[in-house]
């Protein structure tokens, strides 16, 4: 299709080489299409957009994204050629930074129903470059935590070194929706609720004599509880003896609850104690079986191919630890009579 009629937008992604970060492009279609396609949830049942040219498609993305090769080759379908770029409704998510993301990205409606639709497209010229080392050391992270129930703030990483007074006007989005209540380089939250969690995008305009660019940064905001003050507790095994059949295979499961910690390094190990010998057992990796805001339940199993007489003399010890402390639970095997 002819892209010469597409509206054009220039964006700059200055990524930090010190941290992982994502980037997002919005398909900023002309308003009638945009409201119908990308933000259906914002329309009340009585509100009807001025123009409804496209069919609602449940199983296909609402818009199609392409990348324009610099050598003039035909447009490339993003989904087929770029596995690190994810198409999601009306957004394009870049999972990894890098100058190789520099280029022109075009979006247009998936369903073309009228000649009007052919001109309905947006071309985004994206320039990607590493942030200069001169940038301040304390720039805000692209992953920010808000403590539930307290006050907090979300800072725009590309502007966090500037005072509010020198900061340009900022446009904020949360999960793709425009936030109109603030134009400053940080959002102040009076009381943090779970719904404050999400993907925030901050944009500001940078101009020189030749052209103007939208500088964009993406912040993943997580709402968290305070760090636990408790050591983990073992939920299973409950009993200190376990009835078993000799010669049969046996799996002993250790399940423990770890309270939330911002820096979470849970330890879960199985040991065998045999007289004055103690050693760590090589067992399958631990796995998380339930995760909530407040805690996480982790399980690790010890597997015996067949229970021997020797196993009856041993003690099997599950050991769990977090930054606060550790807990153990011992299990002795007893032959079923």
């Amino acid at each position: 299709f002819n892209i010469s009629g597409c509206s054009t937008k220039k964006l700059l992604w200055a990524y930090s080489t010190r941290s992982e970060e994502e980037f997002i492009l919005f398909c900023d279609l002309p308003e009638p299409q945009k409201s119908h396609f990308c933000h259906r949830s914002q329309l009340s049942p009585t509100q009807v957009p001025d123009h409804l040219p496209f069919t609602d498609s449940k199983d296909l993305p609402d818009v199609q994204w392409y990348r324009q090769p610099s050598n003039g080759d035909p447009l490339e379908d993003i989904r087929k050629s770029y596995p690190h770029i994810i198409q999601d409704k009306c957004t394009l998510r870049f999972l990894t930074p890098g100058v190789n993301n520099t280029g022109s990205y075009i979006c247009r409606p998936k369903m073309i129903k009228s000649p009007y639709d052919l001109a309905c497209c947006v071309k985004m010229i994206l320039e990607v470059k590493p942030q200069s080392n001169a940038s301040c050391e304390n720039s805000a992270s692209h992953k920010q935590d808000l403590l539930l129930g307290s006050t907090g703030s979300i800072s725009c990483p590309s502007l966090s070194c500037q005072s509010d007074a020198q900061s340009p006007e900022v446009t904020w989005y949360k999960n793709g929706k425009l936030l109109s209540m603030t134009r400053s380089n940080r959002i102040v939250v009076d009381e943090v609720y779970i719904y404050h969690q999400g993907t925030y995008v901050c944009d500001y305009t940078q101009s020189d004599t030749a052209s103007s660019w939208t500088v964009r940064a993406v912040v993943q905001v997580r709402t968290i509880v305070g760090d636990t003050k408790l050591k983990p507790d073992i939920l299973d095994p409950v009993e200190s003896t376990l009835e078993v059949e000799l010669g049969k295979p046996l799996t002993i499961s250790c399940k423990a609850r770890f309270g939330f910690e911002r820096v979470f390094n849970p330890v879960m190990k199985w040991y065998i104690k045999d007289a004055d010998l103690e050693w760590e057992v090589s067992v399958p990796e631990a796995k998380s079986i339930k995760s909530t805001l407040k805690d996480e339940i982790i399980e690790r199993n010890i597997i015996l191919e067949k229970v021997t007489q020797r196993d009856l003399r041993r003690t099997f010890v599950c050991f769990v630890q977090n930054s606060i402390g550790n807990t153990t639970q011992s299990v002795q095997l007893k032959e079923k009579r």
């Epitope: 190990k269 040991y271 004055d276 010998l277 103690e278 050693w279 760590e280 050991f319 550790n326 153990t328």
Partner: nanobody
Framework: EVQLVESGGGLIQPGGSLRLSCAAS????????MGWYRQAPGKGREMVSV???????NYADSVLGRFTISRDNAKNTVYLQMNALRAEDTAVYKC??????????WGQGTLVTVSS
Amino acid sequence: EVQLVESGGGLIQPGGSLRLSCAASGSISSRDTMGWYRQAPGKGREMVSVISSSGNTNYADSVLGRFTISRDNAKNTVYLQMNALRAEDTAVYKCYAHRTYGVDYWGQGTLVTVSS
């Protein structure tokens, strides 16, 4: 800080013998259990043999009768005598010391390759 340094690995033909040594330095205690684990390419880590300060031992079924573990408490050294080596014994052998639950030390490992 405990450091465990292994030596004695190498290339050996099936049926041959090797003796691995592990010297422990730092705050290692003669009360600590010591031993050997191994990790074959693409496999998980498995316990080969462990020994207590009093000389009690335990072996993996796959090495029983072929491997012998011993230790010199005065020198803080543990040995693994490996006889009748097989191709399936090919692995990185790591020295192990256990102080108490949650306090385990590991060496860098020494490669044993059994091949004709």
